[in-house]
């Protein structure tokens, strides 16, 4: 991305450099180094200090966003002297040109949509490009299918999420022939942006005294197991007065998802539908199709 790197250094420089693609800060190794330290300070004065790499002349920042501008700093002591150097990493380009209102969601277990809006001061010829890097392998995914508005990219559709990990870095760059365009970046957890499908294979079986509802957990992008799910059942008596409260039942995920409830014959016509959520986030899916049981003359 286009970004000015300005170095603030004493006479003998460490030649500090930052590669935004790998998030690696490096400097010239000094002989007889006794102490090295690197860190960044963001606009809110938060300090991030990663571990030094084995060679002690570089460090990699794992989970940082750069679009608000940051200052990197390196301190090195040798047996002879001490070095200090700052590297300013501003988000160059005209203020207000970066993509805004950026958000992504995963749906149907293996599809993802990201959307954004053009910056308020962005020129007419602005074009945005989305790059995604996963936290583990630093592999870069370029947007394969852009969603356009009057020729400007304002979203991205991905139908192959195999390159993602649980936490990913999203970067929206911009270009224009007229002026410099600022970038926008964000870190997103797949856990927090996935919208579940409703549970599948919902069935109801009744005997003379009880009804048993069974269902299967939804297929998800994240690898989740049965205890990671929470379900809500809406058991609804048909043809009741408007405003009558539905019975909402919370059920924890289990190896065999089932809910048994008393319902004696003759039973009125009922419907049941189920929705699912991650037990810790409770971001509810849409409801499953309603399944009817009982009879009109119950």
């Amino acid at each position: 991305e286009k970004s000015d790197l300005r170095t603030v250094a004493p006479a003998s420089s460490l030649n500090v450099r930052f590669d935004s693609r790998t998030m690696n800060l490096s400097w010239d190794c000094q002989e007889n180094t006794t102490f090295s330290k690197c860190f960044l300070t963001d606009k809110k004065n938060r300090v991030v200090e990663p571990r030094l790499s084995n060679n002690e002349c570089s460090c990699t920042f794992r989970e940082i966003c750069l679009h608000e501008g940051v200052t990197f700093e390196v301190h090195v002591n040798t047996s002879q002297r001490g070095f200090q150097q700052k590297l300013l990493y501003p988000n160059s380009g005209r203020e207000g040109t970066a993509a805004q209102n950026f958000s992504c969601f995963i749906y149907n277990a293996d599809l993802m949509n990201c959307t954004w809006a053009r910056g308020p001061t962005a020129p007419r010829d602005v074009q945005y490009f989305l790059y995604i890097r996963n936290s583990k392998r630093r592999r870069e995914i370029r947007c394969p299918y852009y969603i356009q508005d009057s020729g400007t990219h304002v979203g991205c559709h991905l139908d192959n999420l195999s390159g993602l990990t649980s936490r990913n870095y999203f970067l929206v760059n911009g270009t224009s022939r007229e002026i410099g365009i600022q970038f926008f970046d964000s870190l997103l957890d797949t856990k927090k942006i996935e919208r579940f499908n409703p549970p599948s294979n919902v069935t109801v079986r009744c005997n003379t005294t009880h009804c048993l509802v069974r269902w299967k957990q939804p297929r998800t992008y994240q690898k989740l197991s049965y205890l990671d799910f929470q379900y809500q059942l809406d058991v609804h008596r048909k043809n009741t007065q408007p405003g009558t409260e539905n019975l909402l039942i919370n059920v924890s995920g289990d190896l065999e998802n089932r809910y048994n409830f008393p319902s004696s014959e003759p039973r009125a016509k009922h419907s049941v539908k189920i929705r699912a959520a991650d037990v810790r986030i409770l971001n509810w899916s849409s409801w499953s199709e309603a399944i009817e049981f009982g009879s009109d003359d119950g």
Epitope: S166, Q222, K223, S225, Y226, L227, D228, L255, E256
Partner: antibody, heavy 120, light 111 residues
Framework: QVQLVQSGAEVKKPGASVKVSCKIS????????IHWVRQTPTKGFEWMGG????????VYAQRFQGRVTMTEDTSIDTAYLTLSSLRSDDTAVYYC?????????????WGQGTMVTVSS | QAVLTQPSSVSGAPGQRVTISCTGS?????????VSWYQQLPGTAPKLLIY???KRPSGVPDRFSASKSGTSASLAITGLQADDEADYYC???????????FGGGTKVTVL
């Protein structure tokens, strides 16, 4: 009702290998993830390895690396643990367990355990 | 030496409340990774009691509850019963070991 049924107790000589099986009934193995944990009176519970969704493969605990292999035969809903180059301190009860949650791993259901004795 | 530290034993009279502590470090419970608790009756396999720090699987009575704060967690048993006499283990994940870690176990005796 889902159950994990493990193979019977084994007595092995040092240097030998042991293969423990874990048969799942009431559910399809292909829809589950199995981990293996052992228990000794001195060291307590030790995680040995299992499926890691982030890596999309079976991962092994560092201390068993190179000696342990975990395999599955989904056609007969059975998971296997093989431990080679057995030593006397491998004497333990070996458990297979179904992963109930991945964040972090929680063991929702355990097999009954297989006692492995390593003795010359 | 277990990675998570538990008292070796606790005891209480029937109907009483007992608590079991589980202390970890910044690479496991404090990381923060969730804690699970298991009950192991003599001669049997462990059974899950608590997951995600404080959630009970279906079938586990609400006499069992748990909480987590910082680098430690605790399990409480209220209305102690004779069949609660068992070993109890805490478990979490450790990022430095890249795997599950357990406590050494606490024997609960009903007086």
């Amino acid at each position: 009702q889902v159950q994990l049924v493990q193979s019977g107790a084994e007595v092995k000589k040092p240097g030998a290998s042991v293969k423990v099986s874990c048969k799942i009934s009431g559910h399809s193995l292909s829809e589950l993830s199995i981990h293996w944990v052992r228990q000794t009176p001195t060291k307590g519970f030790e995680w040995m390895g299992g499926f890691d969704p982030e890596e999309n493969e079976i991962v092994y605990a560092q201390r068993f690396q190179g000696r342990v292999t975990m395999t599955e035969d989904t056609s007969i809903d059975t998971a296997y643990l093989t431990l080679s180059s057995l030593r006397s301190d491998d004497t333990a009860v070996y458990y297979c367990a179904i992963v109930g949650s991945f964040s972090p791993v929680t063991y929702g259901l355990w097999g009954q355990g297989t006692m492995v004795t390593v003795s010359s | 030496q277990a990675v998570l530290t538990q008292p070796s034993s606790v005891s209480g009279a029937p109907g009483q409340r007992v608590t079991i502590s589980c202390t970890g470090s910044g690479s496991n419970i404090g990381a923060p990774y969730d804690v699970s608790w298991y009950q192991q009756l003599p001669g049997t396999a462990p059974k899950l009691l608590i997951y995600h720090n404080n959630k009970r699987p279906s079938g586990v009575p609400d006499r069992f509850s748990a909480s987590k704060s910082g680098t430690s967690a605790s399990l409480a048993i209220t209305g102690l019963q004779a069949d609660d006499e068992a070993d109890y283990y805490c478990q979490s994940y450790d990022s430095s070991l890249s795997g599950s870690v357990f406590g050494g176990g606490t024997k609960v005796t009903v007086l």
